[in-house]
């Protein structure tokens, strides 16, 4: 092909090529043609004769102002036609007359201000029609009933001011899953406008200035329709009362989006008319007081998003939002509750009472004063089958005994990014009989005891990154009870002392993070009593991160038991010489990171076993000694291997001898080494 299109599997991509005409040298069997972002002004039908197999044609982002009706005659199998971001202004009855097999027609961002006659009457198979971002002033798309298979009609970002039944009755035989009317200036819903449509399942009116009064009228017009999904995000709905959604009483609404409304007052029984509602989006509002009956009637809601819904008006404590006790008691089917990023004063004793199906609760950054978790804090969740609880970013400083004793079903507890500073007696976790993961990373300090985790033997994941961990060297180990542990993160704790039995009995451990500590002394032969083999027995370990520990020595047998190790990260240490056979048992090793060490020599007797099945190697920024003795084997291996070695050309440079300083390692000439080298290459 003379054009620079890329063709693969009957798909031709000719985008972004500044084309002024349709290429004539593409394979004739292509089914998809992408001509977006070019300089096409017209689409001569004749140019498509050879591409009669096309099912999808995308000519978006060009300057096409007219369409030849014959185009679709040449493309009898065309199903998807995308004309977005062009300069079409007129559509005649002939424009798409031959496009009878179309299922998708995209006309967004053109200059179509009015639809005359019936340009879409032949599109009996059309499923999606996108006319958003045009200048349409009405929803009138024709004068007779048509588009009986249409499911999505997208009319957002136009200039529509009223919905009229006589304009929408062309859809009398259609079942619209999505009528998208967002970002219009709708001021009127004429009587029967939605009843003109055969069946309407989804209505999207985001960014339409409805306000409480027009919202109420809208809902009355939706009465006795098939509406399931209603989205009214950013519609200036500042208050709701027990009449706002009254019209929806005669519907089976399952999804309601009221996000970004600056909603301030949610009156009692506002949603009493929505017993079928399952998904309720209320995020980014400004609710000052949630009354005990504000959510009354929402018996079927399964998902409720209240993220950033309760925010304080000013710095004054008196302006903090209020949630009455028992406010959630009506939500008997609620499974997922998101209350992130709020300014709620605290958890009251009956805040969550009645949520008998709640499984997921996010309270991240939700409270202004949740400094201490007591044995009363979560009492209102005692009858909830909670599986996941997120308490991050709440400035929690202390967890008292029995704080979670009400949460016997809890599997994941996230307490990260708080200010917890205390001795962990183990009583904090009492009652967590099904706990799977505790995330405690990024807290102030944690002092461990032999019983810190005695009551949670089911624990499989424990994250203790950057918590200024104390007493980790006690014996028996604080981790001794955790025989089901598969992931342990002890990184960024500046740990300098640990015993050889710290990880004893953790035979199921698969991931161990010990990066950014101070463990160098433990592996020194000069260490009193010899090196400490704290990795012994971890026969199922898959990932080991020991980055940034200051290691300058590795004992020869330190990885001996780690038969299943797949990833070792020893980067950013001070390793120079590694003992031969140190990696002999690492038959499963896939990734080895030794970047930014002091390695000068890469010899077969040390690295041969480790490199055998490697898929990724990182030895960047080491001061390689470019001599035959030091790197000849390595260079030969590099040039033969299929292992991925990122930045090989730029960051694997010789340091010595002086005349090779800065020279790329992979270009080191090993041919002169063969005769004189007293070792096997």
């Amino acid at each position: 092909s003379t054009t620079k299109c890329t063709v693969s599997h009957e798909v031709a991509d000719c985008s972004h090529l500044k084309l002024t005409q349709v290429p004539d040298d593409l394979p004739t069997n292509i089914t998809v043609l992408n001509l977006t972002h070019n300089q096409l002004r017209r689409l001569p039908a004749a140019n498509f004769t050879r591409y009669s197999q096309l099912t999808s044609l995308d000519v978006g982002f060009n300057t096409i102002s007219k369409l030849e009706p014959e185009l679709c005659q040449k493309l009898p199998m065309l199903k998807v036609l995308n004309l977005q971001h062009n300069e079409l202004s007129q559509l005649s009855d002939k424009t798409f007359a031959f496009c009878t097999n179309l299922t998708e027609l995209h006309l967004m961002s053109n200059s179509i201000q009015k639809i005359k006659n019936n340009p879409f009457v032949k599109q009996k198979n059309l499923i999606t029609l996108d006319l958003s971002h045009n200048g349409l002033s009405s929803t009138k798309l024709g004068t007779q009933v048509q588009l009986e298979n249409l499911q999505e009609l997208l009319l957002s970002n136009n200039k529509i001011q009223a919905l009229k039944s006589e304009e929408l009755d062309i859809f009398a035989n259609s079942s619209l899953k999505k009528l998208e009317l967002s970002s219009n200036q709708i001021k009127e819903f004429s009587p029967g406008c939605f009843h003109a449509i055969g069946r309407l399942f989804g209505l999207f009116l985001n960014n339409v200035q409805l306000g409480p009064s027009l919202t109420e009228k809208l809902c009355l017009e939706l009465a006795n329709t098939s509406i399931r999904n209603l989205s009214l995000s950013n519609s200036q709905l500042s208050t709701t009362s027990n009449t706002t959604f009254l019209g929806l009483k005669w519907t089976n609404l399952t999804m309601l989006d009221l996000s970004y409304n600056n909603l301030n007052v949610v009156g009692n029984d506002s949603f009493a008319w929505l017993p079928q509602l399952e998904y309720f989006f209320l995020e980014y509002n400004n609710i000052q007081h949630l009354f005990s009956h504000s959510l009354h009637g929402l018996f079927n809601v399964r998902y409720l998003n209240l993220k950033r819904s309760f925010t304080k008006q000013s710095i004054s404590l008196a302006s903090l939002p209020k949630i009455d006790d028992f406010s959630f008691q009506w939500l008997k089917c609620l499974e997922h509750l998101n209350m992130e990023d709020n300014d709620i004063p605290g958890i009251k004793s009956n805040m969550f009472t009645g949520l008998i199906n709640l499984k997921y609760l996010s309270l991240s950054n939700s409270f202004t004063s949740l400094r201490t978790l007591t044995n009363e804090t979560f009492v209102s969740l005692a009858h909830s089958p909670l599986h996941i609880l997120n308490l991050t970013k709440n400035k929690i400083s202390k967890i008292e005994s029995d704080a979670f004793s009400w949460l016997g079903h809890l599997e994941v507890l996230d307490l990260g990014l708080n200010e917890i500073g205390q001795e962990l007696t183990g009583q904090e976790w009492r009652g967590l009989e099904n706990i799977f993961e505790i995330y405690l990373s990024y807290n102030k300090y944690l002092q461990l005891t032999r019983n810190s985790f005695a009551l949670v033997p089911s624990l499989q994941r424990l994250m203790l990154r950057r918590v200024a961990l104390k007493n980790v060297d006690s014996s028996p180990s604080p981790f001794q009870p955790l025989r089901n542990l598969t992931i342990l993160d002890l990184s960024n704790n500046n740990i300098a002392n640990i015993n050889d039995d710290m990880l004893e009995g953790l035979e199921k451990l698969e991931i161990l993070d010990l990066q950014h500590n101070n463990l160098a002394r433990l592996w020194k032969h000069a260490n009193p009593g010899g090196p400490i083999y704290f990795l012994k027995g971890l026969s199922h370990l898959h990932i080991l991160n020991l980055e940034s520990n200051g290691f300058d020595e590795i004992p020869v047998e330190v990885f001996k038991d780690l038969f299943e190790l797949k990833i070792i990260d020893l980067g950013l240490n001070n390793l120079n010489t590694l003992p031969a056979s140190v990696f002999n048992n690492q038959v499963s090793l896939k990734s080895l990171n030794l970047q930014k060490n002091l390695i000068t020599s890469v010899e077969k007797k040390v690295f041969g076993p480790a490199f055998r099945n490697l898929t990724e190697l990182d030895m960047r920024f080491n001061p390689f000694d470019c001599t035959c003795e030091s790197i000849a084997w390595f260079v030969n291996w590099i040039n033969e291997t299929h292992t991925n070695i990122p930045e090989l050309s730029s960051h694997y440079l010789c340091n010595t001898p002086p005349h090779y300083h800065g020279f790329p390692v992979r270009l080191f000439d090993t041919s002169s080494c063969k005769d004189s080298a007293p070792f096997e290459l």
Epitope: N451, P476, Q480, P481
Partner: antibody, heavy 119, light 107 residues
């Protein structure tokens, strides 16, 4: 199933030493600490100390620290408790015990070894 | 060291009676307390751990309560086979001391 089998009864003279053994079976010997508890005749129970069979690390009850030695032989899954400078008040049944999945309890006990100190 | 004080040292009750034994720790042991039953010439048998959790195979007439320093073992309806000495033991920090024992007899 977990079993702890102890050596037989011993009679010792004051000033002598006694070494009681505890053979473990039904689990991996090196993964659970072994504790020693004694019970003087007609008296209560007294915790003496614990040993890690994996590395031999020991935590003793200060009361016995100068006289007791705890050791193990991993090849035969056996723990030992040796008490020296025996006195008549050391006459007692000596038990080895092991914690369960919940490490704050002794569900597993040896059958006990009676040590009699008598001149 | 934490001392464990058990009371009473002995008691006599009728079959079917509710029996209560208390154990007091000299310091906070949280809920790390176990109760054992020992019959004459036998090995101690675990009844309750973590202050209130019933060990496997133990009849439901046995129950435990308490936290911190004060703990209770209750036999809701005394049976002839419950004649034994009962010991409490803490597991907070070494040494793991035992209470002096409570001998339970049938009237």
């Amino acid at each position: 199933q977990v079993q702890l089998v102890q050596s037989g009864a011993e009679v010792k003279k004051p000033g002598a030493s006694v070494k009681v053994s505890c053979k473990a079976s039904g689990y991996t010997f090196t993964t659970y600490w072994i504790h020693w508890v004694r019970q003087a005749t007609g008296q209560g129970l007294e915790w003496m100390g614990e040993i890690n069979p994996n590395n031999g690390r020991i935590n003793y009850n200060e009361k016995f620290k100068t006289r007791v030695t705890m050791t193990r032989n991993t090849s035969i899954s056996t723990a030992y408790m040796e008490l020296s400078s025996l006195r008549s008040e050391d006459t007692a049944v000596y038990y080895c015990a092991r914690v369960g999945v919940m490490i704050t309890t002794f569900p597993y006990w040896g059958q006990g070894t009676l040590v009699t100190v008598s001149s | 060291d934490i001392q464990m004080t058990q009371s009473p040292s002995s008691l006599s009750a009728s079959v079917g009676d509710r029996v209560t034994i208390t154990c007091r720790a000299s310091g906070n042991i949280h809920n790390y307390l176990a109760w054992y039953q020992q019959k004459p010439g036998k090995v101690p048998k675990l009844l309750i751990y973590n202050a209130k959790t019933l060990a496997d195979g133990v009849p439901s007439r046995f129950s435990g309560s308490g936290s911190g320093t004060d703990f209770t073992l209750t036999i809701s309806s005394l049976q002839p086979e419950d004649v034994a000495t009962y010991y409490c033991q803490h597991f907070w920090s070494t040494p793991f001391t035992f209470g002096g024992g409570t001998k339970v007899e049938i009237k």
